[in-house]
């Protein structure tokens, strides 16, 4: 959804054997919008594979056609394969649906990597492991694509969960979640727990595994520990937030905070990496290199091109620093920080040559379109997209991969002044120049 490396997403086993699950903490929290507590029917409704995307099962049409759909908070179109494609096991057959309505309009969506086009219509849509409702939603029937579908990913479409402003062909095309909230009593909120496996998964493991949960209309306490901390949604287009400080192993990067949000910072489940603006990326890599200097890594590793491998079970997690992003809080001059481990930003990949080794790619990369908090960030946390109150909540995920020495963390409050100055104001340009990222 955002430009840059947007391999649609990665996921893995919930409570991966290589990582420890944190115990639940009990805590009292203020009343939240939406239903709270247990959403048993929606827990574990996501699956996926490292670097290829988290997907949920959906049904479209009458009689229902079942498809796996990538969950993408960085775009706003609901689009499904609607023609044969070498990488699709199945696709939406509009002619078989008695409830399909043609909108008589074409649509084209370019991502940074990958593009698709298709024809707009509406049909009845439901989520079997979601709320027990059926809605009439806009659907883009993808008829042509390039580098969009991924061989072996097991998903056939994309569910853009961001706002109408970035919908294609224009903001008059109501996104799925807006339709859902308008047509039902589902509260205007959803939450995501993306569970990284901590190790690569083969095809059969992916199909058998849990990749996480998308809780539609509420918050499930079993999916996180500690407290939820909220940051304002700066503008309702992407899920835009403001980063006010960045630390590597507790050391402040000491940059003008505008740089962290140049030209925006977004939370995007459809992007694999943590993507950082050029200057920030360079400073962060310099700091991470320095912190991990007991081992030397090739330049290609830091560019995300080369893997590094260690003998199975010997990955030196301790030499890699933790990364903390401070986000604007809900209270004036108050911020909180989210901290990820190398277990999040080193992405496990299969090395065909040495399958007995544990191999990783560096999953922090450079961006020309701002900060993208992709799976690398989200796999550490339970993330609440509280649209009703225009805020995003973060809590430590009950399924994040960690070790016996360190865990991901969400901590606050911290005093931070002039946080509004950290936001970058994008010059108003022709909306047609807007790119949807997917890397």
């Amino acid at each position: 959804t955002q430009h840059g490396i947007r391999l649609p997403l990665r996921s893995g086993l919930g409570g991966a054997p290589l990582g420890l699950r944190l115990p639940r903490e009990t805590d009292e929290e203020p009343e939240e919008p939406g239903r709270r507590g247990s959403f048993v029917e929606m827990v574990d409704n996501l699956r996926g594979k490292s670097g290829q995307g988290y997907y949920v099962e959906m049904t479209v049409g009458s009689p229902p056609q079942t498809l796996n759909i990538l969950v993408d908070t960085g775009s706003s179109n609901f689009a499904v394969g609607a023609a044969p494609h070498p990488f699709l096991h199945r696709y939406y057959q509009r002619q078989l649906s008695s409830t399909y309505r043609d909108l008589r309009k074409g649509v084209y969506v370019p991502y940074t990597q990958g593009k698709w086009e298709g024809e707009l219509g509406t049909d009845l849509v439901s989520i079997p492991h979601g709320p027990n409702v059926t809605v009439r939603a806009n659907i883009a029937a993808i008829t042509e694509s390039d580098k969009f579908f991924i061989n072996g990913s097991n998903w056939e479409g994309i569910l853009g969960l961001a706002y109408a402003e970035i919908a294609r062909p224009d903001d008059s095309l109501e996104p799925f979640f807006d339709s859902l909230v308008k047509q039902t009593h589902v509260p205007n909120l959803f939450s995501l727990q993306l569970c990284g496996a901590g190790f690569p998964l083969n095809q059969s493991e992916v199909l058998a595994s849990v990749g996480g949960s998308m809780i539609i209309g509420g918050i499930d306490h079993s999916l996180y520990t500690g407290s939820l901390w909220y940051t304002p949604i700066r503008r309702e287009w992407y899920y835009e937030v403001i980063i006010v400080r960045v630390e590597i192993n507790g050391q402040d990067l000491k940059m003008d905070c505008k740089e962290y949000n140049y030209d925006k910072s977004i939370v995007d489940s459809g992007t694999t990496n943590l993507r950082l603006p050029k200057k920030v990326f360079e400073a962060a890599v310099k700091s991470i290199k320095a912190a991990s200097s007991t081992e030397k890594f090739p330049d290609g590793f830091w560019l995300g091109e080369q893997l590094v491998c260690w003998q199975a079970g010997t990955t030196p997690w301790n030499i890699f620093p933790v990364i903390s992003l401070y986000l604007m809080g809900e209270v004036t001059n108050q911020s909180f920080r989210i901290t990820i481990l190398p277990q999040q930003y080193l992405r496990p990949v299969e090395d065909v040559a040495t399958s007995q080794d544990d191999c990783y790619k560096f999953a922090i990369s450079q961006s020309s379109t701002g900060t993208v908090m992709g799976a690398v960030i989200m796999e550490g946390f339970y993330v609440v997209f509280d649209r009703a109150r225009k805020r995003i909540g973060f809590a430590v995920s009950a399924c994040h991969v960690h070790d016996e020495f360190r865990t991901a963390a969400v901590e606050g409050p911290f005093v931070t002044l002039d946080m509004e100055d950290c936001g970058y104001n994008i010059p108003q340009t022709d909306e047609s120049t807007l790119m949807t990222g997917r890397a």
Partner: antibody, heavy 124, light 107 residues
């Protein structure tokens, strides 16, 4: 230089069939959308059909849907329009046109240049 | 179906004069509109695409403006070779439709 050469036009009786061809040269044919536009004698222009670079996306005017079929052979750099159940109102000069990209619905992907056209006359 | 209404049907002007051609859509087409020029016995050629972008090789005297339902093609100073028929066309909705054309003739 881009060249588009239409052929296959002629006189046909109502209810008959005709297959138009458009031989393309001067560009990588498979990476561009292609289309057909017609112009009845002394009248304005009407879109007939179009197809994306790989043929995945296709467009038909309501007036020809179910009767005309657009296709392309990327190995032969040729675009086709199979016209069945022809009617008097299908009488026109049929132009072949090159899209601006492989995409049919992308902004900026408009059709230019056009061939010189081939005349189809449907009459008894 | 989106109807494109071009006005005037005929525009009689002298070389060097400014020509302003209008195209009105029956509903919004956003910026998915283009202008083509057609001379007698020739195929149409693209002048302006996406409402305001000049196609490759088109002289700067041609400009397009507008979005939504009202569009204008302006020829700042008519050259002898500009006397022709001009069509607007939309690709926002199916069916793609052309306007009826404006003939720019020598006064």
């Amino acid at each position: 230089e881009v060249q588009l050469l239409e052929s296959g036009g002629g006189l046909v009786q109502p209810g008959g069939s005709l297959r138009l061809s458009c031989a393309a040269s001067g560009f990588t044919f498979s990476t561009y959308a292609m289309g057909w536009v017609r112009q009845a004698p002394g009248k304005g222009l009407e879109w007939v059909s179009a197809t994306s670079g790989s043929g995945g996306s296709t467009y038909y005017a309501d007036s020809v849907k179910g009767r005309f079929t657009i296709s392309r052979d990327n190995s032969k750099n040729t675009l086709y329009l199979q016209m069945n159940s022809l009617r008097a109102e299908d009488t026109a000069v049929y132009y072949c046109a090159k899209g601006g990209s492989q995409w049919l619905y992308a902004p900026g992907s408009w059709f230019d240049p056009w061939g010189q056209g081939t005349l189809v006359t449907v009459s008894s | 179906e989106i109807v494109l209404t071009q006005s005037p049907a005929t525009l009689s002007l002298s070389p060097g004069e400014r020509a302003t051609l209008s195209c009105r859509a029956s509903q919004s087409v956003s910026s998915y509109l283009a202008w083509y020029q057609q001379k007698p016995g020739q195929a149409p050629r693209l002048l302006i695409y996406d409402a305001s972008n000049r196609a490759t090789g088109i002289p700067a005297r041609f400009s397009g403006s507008g979005s939504g339902t009202d569009f204008t093609l302006t020829i700042s100073s008519l050259e002898p070779e500009d006397f022709a028929v001009y069509y607007c066309v939309q690709r926002s909705n199916f069916p793609w439709t052309f306007g009826g054309g404006t003939k720019v003739e020598i006064k």
